[in-house]
Interface confidence: medium
C-alpha cells in the first residue's frame, strides 16, 4: 500500500533570465527512494539515481544544475520554460510517486511588480 505523499513548491514564478529551484519532498513513507526523474511536459530534464548520481539530459546540459538535494536548478530562464514540471519518485517497495509544479516565467518588468504565484 502506498502511504507516501509528495510535497512540492506548487505554483511558482521566476524572472526571465534568472534561475529557479524545483523541489519536491516525499514524506509519510519509509520506502527507499531509488531514483528521482525530473520531467517537463514532454521531455526529460534530469535523473538522480541513488547509486549512480545525476544524469542531465543532453538538451539541458547548459541550463540545468543538479540539486540542492534531489531538487533541480533551472537557469537562464526563458518565457518558453513556462509550464508544468514533474518530479517522479521511484521507490521500493511502494512504487512510483509523482509531484507537479507549475512554473511561470515572467518578463522582468512584470516580475518586479510582484509574481502572480507564491510558494506555499
Amino acid at each position: 500500500m502506498m502511504t507516501g505523499t509528495i510535497e512540492t513548491t506548487g505554483n511558482i514564478s521566476a524572472e526571465k533570465g534568472g534561475s529557479i529551484i524545483l523541489q519536491c519532498h516525499l514524506s509519510s513513507t519509509t520506502a527507499q527512494v531509488t531514483q528521482v526523474n525530473w520531467e517537463q511536459q514532454d521531455q526529460l530534464l534530469a535523473i538522480c539515481n541513488a547509486d549512480l548520481g545525476w544524469h542531465i539530459s543532453p538538451s539541458f546540459k547548459d541550463r540545468v544544475a543538479p540539486g540542492p538535494g534531489l531538487g533541480l536548478t533551472l537557469q537562464s530562464l526563458t518565457v518558453n520554460d513556462t509550464g508544468e514540471y514533474f518530479c517522479i519518485y521511484h521507490t521500493y517497495p511502494d512504487g512510483t510517486y509523482t509531484g507537479r509544479i507549475f512554473l511561470e516565467v515572467l518578463e522582468s518588468s512584470v516580475a518586479e511588480h510582484g509574481a502572480r504565484f507564491q510558494i506555499p
Epitope: 531514483q35 514532454d42 526529460l44 539515481n49 549512480l52
Partner: antibody
Framework: QLQLQESGPGLVKPSETLSLTCTVS??????????WGWIRQPPGKGLEWIGY???????YYNPSLKSRVTIAVDTSKNQFSLKLSSVTAADTAVYYC??????????WGQGNLVTVSS | EIVLTQSPGTLSLSPGERATLSCRAS???????LAWYQQKPGQAPRLLIY???SRATGIPDRFSGSGSGTDFTLTISRLEPEDFAVYYC????????FGQGTKLEIK
Amino acid sequence: QLQLQESGPGLVKPSETLSLTCTVSGGSISSSRYFWGWIRQPPGKGLEWIGYIYYRGSTYYNPSLKSRVTIAVDTSKNQFSLKLSSVTAADTAVYYCASSSAWYFDYWGQGNLVTVSS
Amino acid sequence: EIVLTQSPGTLSLSPGERATLSCRASQSVSSSYLAWYQQKPGQAPRLLIYGASSRATGIPDRFSGSGSGTDFTLTISRLEPEDFAVYYCQQYGSLYTFGQGTKLEIK
C-alpha cells in the same frame, strides 16, 4: 524481466531507408525508468550507439548519424522504432535494440542483421 | 567525444587463470558512467559491470571492476570455459561510446 525483440527486413537497397521495430515485453515502454536505444555492430567489428528515446518522446542521437536517424515510440503497441535514411554498404550491421538506465544498457534484443546491397 | 582504448586486443589464457582487461579513456570519465559487457559469438552483449565496480544482476562474483579517472580494469579471478568471449567497455559522457573490444581466447 524485460525482453526486447527486433523485427524488420534483412536486406535494404542503397539510398533507401532502413526501418526496424523493437517490441518490448515484461514491462511497459511508458516506464520513466528507462530509455529505449539502438546500437549497431558491423560484421566482425565493435559496437556503435545510434540513439535513444525517452517514453515522453524526447530523443538523443549519435552526432555522426543524427542527420539520417529517427527514433520513435508507440506506447499503444509497447514498441519503439528506428529509421535510418540514405543507407550505404557501410550501414550493413547487426542492429540491436536495448533498454538503458541512462548510464548503461541492461537488456538487449537478440539483434537483427541488416545487409545493404542492391 | 571520449575515446575508449582497450588492451590487449587479444588475451590468450587457460581456464583457471586470472584475466585482467584494461580500458583507457581519452579524458576523465565519472566512475558512474563506466560499464563492461561480455559478448559471445552470435549473441547480444550482456551487461557485466556498471558504475565501474558494481556487478549486474546474476553476474558471478569472479567478475570484478575497478578504476577511476581514465583507467579502468575488468578482472576475472578464475576463468571458466564459458568466460571466453569478447569484452567491451562503455562510457556515458555526453554520448555513449564503446571500446573496440578485447577478445579473450583459450590458450
